[in-house]
């Protein structure tokens, strides 16, 4: 499966939008820093089949979409930027869903790579728990925005490595 050229452009646009969502200086939120234990091993491609990587990337983007489409994110972040971000993520999900169908078929995909998918879910569960504990403060959102930028960048790198292997 070849992801369209627009896919990598969409990735870049999504990252730019995340960067633009910054509302306060990260330096004013140093006390709120938190290690969410990003599941790095799920984004190291050494053991990956392509279909597995696509499934993990899809889960990563789906969870990012879910996180930023809550009423709490709308209250904390710029709605115009959020709307543009949703459009980019939605396109990414559509591209990856087409690929999942081609690579593994509709029946196998959810269960075959469940361990990797669950690692991503647990990571996002920790992020949502952190936001709840911090009462969705502006600093908490800044910490999370920076974290998602980092994890999103790592997932883009995995996509690039997949493309270079084709």
């Amino acid at each position: 499966c070849d992801l369209p050229q627009t896919h990598s452009l969409g990735n870049r646009r999504a990252l730019i939008l995340l960067a633009q969502m910054r509302r306060i200086s990260p330096f004013s939120c140093l006390k709120d820093r938190h290690d969410f234990e990003f599941p790095q091993e799920e984004f190291d491609d050494k053991q990956f089949q392509k279909a597995q990587a696509i499934s993990v990337l899809h889960e990563m983007i789906q969870q990012t979409f879910n996180l930023f489409s809550t009423k709490d994110s709308s209250a904390a972040l710029d709605e115009t930027l959020l709307d543009e971000f949703y459009i980019e993520l939605d396109q990414q999900l559509n591209d990856l869903e087409s690929c999942v169908m081609q690579e593994v078929g509709v029946i196998e995909s959810p269960l075959m790579y469940e361990d990797s998918i669950l690692a991503v879910r647990k990571y996002f569960q920790r992020i949502t728990l952190y936001l709840t504990e911090k009462k969705y403060s502006s600093c908490a959102w800044e910490v999370v925005r920076a974290e998602i930028m980092r994890s999103f960048s790592l997932s883009i790198n995995l996509q690039k490595r997949l493309k270079s292997k084709e």
Partner: antibody, heavy 122, light 107 residues
Framework: EVQLVQAGAEVKAPGESLRISCKVS????????ISWVRQIPGKGLEWMVK????????IYNPSFQGHVSISVDKSITTVYLQWSSLQASDTAIYYC???????????????WGQGTLVAVSS | DIQMTQSPSSLSASVGDSVTITCRAS??????FHWYRQKPGKAPELLIY???NLQTGVPSRFTGSGSGTECTLTITSLQPDDFATYYC?????????FGQGTKLDVR
């Protein structure tokens, strides 16, 4: 087949320490949260604590925090619940449970151990 | 803590009957409601998750519905195996909490 096999019943005196175990098999140990649930005989269910075996990240029910501790041994895919000083009120059946986590990040308990009865009496 | 209140606390019925158990949460838990059945002397088992999803292997006689602060478990065409205690649970907020249980016995 997913299995959570718990250690047998324990009879202890107040003030003694205890560690009960839950050996899991049939799935990738580090992929799922594990919790402990207490059931006082004839009473309802109380969630105590959960742990992510991947890195031992834990979340406690404040009602149990400081009185029990949870730990894992990844090498033998086993989760433990430990008391340093038992009280008569700890008499209960303790269940270990596996969590499933949906895409909308809903936890639910999809597999249960058979339970360990802990009796604390002088 | 989120309080979970089940009603009724006990219920008598006959094989073949239909019964409904209700669970109310002290605040909204969205669809983070789950139902378990506990047979005497056994560990609980999952029946319904996320308010309305039937766990694999559970007969379709069990149905769950609701969201927000209230959910229901309905069992149609009761079987001998169904006479047990039923618990609802919420996993929307920590600590996770269970209802006090509904004991279903033979009329």
């Amino acid at each position: 087949e997913v299995q959570l096999v718990q250690a047998g019943a324990e009879v202890k005196a107040p003030g003694e320490s205890l560690r009960i175990s839950c050996k899991v098999s049939g799935y990738t140990f580090t992929s799922y949260w594990i919790s402990w649930v207490r059931q006082i005989p004839g009473k309802g269910l109380e969630w105590m604590v959960k742990i992510d075996p991947r890195d031992s990240y834990t979340i406690y029910n404040p009602s149990f925090q400081g009185h029990v501790s949870i730990s894992v041994d990844k090498s033998i895919t086993t989760v433990y619940l430990q008391w340093s000083s038992l009280q008569a009120s700890d008499t209960a059946i303790y269940y270990c449970v596996r969590h499933y986590l949906t895409q909308s990040l809903v936890d639910y308990f999809d597999h249960w151990g058979q339970g360990t009865l802990v009796a604390v009496s002088s | 803590d989120i309080q979970m209140t089940q009603s009724p606390s006990s219920l008598s019925a006959s094989v073949g009957d239909s019964v409904t158990i209700t669970c109310r949460a002290s605040q909204s838990v969205s669809n983070y409601f789950h139902w378990y059945r506990q047979k005497p002397g056994k560990a609980p088992e999952l029946l319904i998750y996320s308010a309305s999803n039937l766990q694999t292997g559970v007969p379709s006689r069990f149905t769950g519905s609701g969201s927000g602060t209230e959910c229901t478990l309905t069992i149609t065409s009761l079987q001998p195996d169904d006479f047990a205690t039923y618990y609802c649970q919420q996993t929307h907020g920590y600590p996770f909490t269970f209802g006090q249980g509904t004991k279903l016995d033979v009329r």
